[in-house]
Interface confidence: medium
């Protein structure tokens, strides 16, 4: 697909543009903003806490252009990349290079997308072709999930209730997925 590659702050080689409007979560844009969730938690010892609300993972904001064949969005969209090791929220770094990383023994904890939002984008096409409108899925919040030794990556287990702020402006989900507290949605760029 002729993806352009460049290095971001973490020196990872990544695609700038993709066929589908969501690059894999591990691929970060060069315009990232690191933020640790749920600061100011009560000071429990990280290795003794049983309160799952103590656990969280990093959310990186990144911007990218949406492409569809030769067409590209007029403006970049902003979404989240779920990144980093899940652990006690108070130990997650507030900025790159600060804070301590905590790694649990036993099961693997992964930071993965939790909620999505839909956003309409206007795609501009070359050669005088009419602009196209597309609705894209964007990651709106992340959560920790537990991957047991006996399961592959498609069988991630919910790690309790996510340590996250309530999501704004969202109706309760009618389907019987567990109701979770969710982070505020990213503002639409349009």
């Amino acid at each position: 697909q002729g993806w352009q590659a460049f290095k971001n702050d973490a020196t990872e080689i990544i695609p700038e543009l993709g066929e589908y409007p969501e690059p894999p979560p591990e691929l970060e844009n060069n315009k990232t903003m690191n933020r640790a969730e749920n600061g100011g938690r009560p000071p429990h010892h990280p290795f003794e806490t049983k309160d799952v609300s103590e656990y969280s993972c990093r959310e990186l904001h990144f911007t990218r252009y949406v492409t569809d064949g030769p067409c590209r969005s007029a403006k970049p969209v902003t979404e989240l990349v779920c990144s980093g090791q899940c652990g006690p929220a108070r130990l997650l770094p507030n900025a790159i290079g600060r804070g301590k990383w905590w790694r649990p023994s036993g099961p693997d904890f992964r930071c993965i997308p939790d909620r999505y939002r839909a956003q309409r984008v206007q795609l501009l096409c070359p050669g005088g072709e009419a602009p196209r409108a597309r609705k894209v899925r964007l990651v709106a919040s992340c959560k920790c999930k537990r991957l047991t030794r006996f399961h592959n990556q498609s069988e991630l287990k919910d790690f309790g209730t996510e340590a996250a702020r309530p999501q704004k402006g969202r109706k309760p989900r009618p389907r019987a997925r567990s109701a979770k507290a969710n982070q505020a949605e990213l503002e639409n760029a349009y």
Partner: antibody, heavy 117, light 111 residues
Framework: QVQLVESGGGLVQPGGSLRLSCAAS????????LSWVRQAPGKGLEWVSN????????YYADSVKGRFTISRDNSKNTLYLQMNSLRAEDTAVYYC??????????WGQGTLVTVSS | DIALTQPASVSGSPGQSITISCTGT?????????VSWYQQHPGKAPKLMIY???NRPSGVSNRFSGSKSGNTASLTISGLQAEDEADYYC???????????FGGGTKLTVL
């Protein structure tokens, strides 16, 4: 051209298991969400499950949650559906579909799963 | 559960226009403004006919068009032809997980 080819369907007894596969070609597999959609004989389409590009996010219809597991192998360009504790009401043609821009732009030809004793 | 409601059947004569409706709750069609339509002939896989309310994929006849008003989306087929006889399904996505949901389907009979 984009192609999705399902396999693995067949006759299975209630309570049994089956694993469906969907081999994809003609597009950048790892750049797309994928879904399984089923259709019981003489009935309408029912979305079953979907999975994001790297397999880290998976979602299921209430009717199959806890029994079915969707997964993918991007190195093999293959989508899977592991079906356990099968019931008679799971009898259907199962389609894999490419889930692009929140609609299904390409579908496989389907594979029939029959759950009967 | 969220549901999209379609009429079970519609019919029309060759050359006529018909409209199939798809009504949903505010958490799918009404709020999200994104409805797709699929055509399915007996024994065949569904085929995408309309996406994002009113967009046609390349290769789909311009006799097919989509629209939406409030929480009801509509598929209109003008100049009905015999080969249009098929089942038609609307589809949207629901909730903050953006999982997919289909209407119950409408059987179109060309008289």
């Amino acid at each position: 051209q984009v192609q999705l080819v399902e396999s693995g369907g067949g006759l299975v007894q209630p309570g049994g298991s089956l694993r469906l596969s969907c081999a994809a070609s003609g597009f950048t597999f790892r750049s797309h969400w994928l879904s399984w959609v089923r259709q019981a004989p003489g009935k309408g389409l029912e979305w079953v499950s979907n999975i994001n590009y790297d397999g880290s996010s998976t979602y299921y219809a209430d009717s199959v949650k806890g029994r079915f597991t969707i997964s993918r192998d991007n190195s093999k360009n293959t989508l899977y559906l592991q079906m356990n504790s099968l019931r008679a009401e799971d009898t259907a043609v199962y389609y894999c579909a490419r889930d692009t821009y929140l609609h299904f732009d390409y579908w496989g030809q389907g594979t029939l799963v029959t759950v009967s004793s | 559960d969220i549901a999209l409601t379609q009429p079970a059947s519609v019919s029309g004569s060759p050359g006529q226009s018909i409209t199939i409706s798809c009504t949903g709750t505010s958490s799918d069609v009404g709020d999200i403004n994104d409805v797709s339509w699929y055509q399915q002939h007996p024994g065949k896989a569904p085929k995408l006919m309309i996406y994002d309310v009113n967009n046609r994929p390349s290769g789909v006849s311009n006799r097919f068009s989509g629209s939406k008003s409030g929480n009801t989306a509509s598929l209109t087929i003008s100049g009905l032809q015999a080969e249009d006889e098929a089942d038609y399904y609307c589809q949207s996505y629901a909730g903050s997980y953006l999982s997919e949901v289909f209407g119950g389907g409408t059987k179109l009979t060309v008289l």
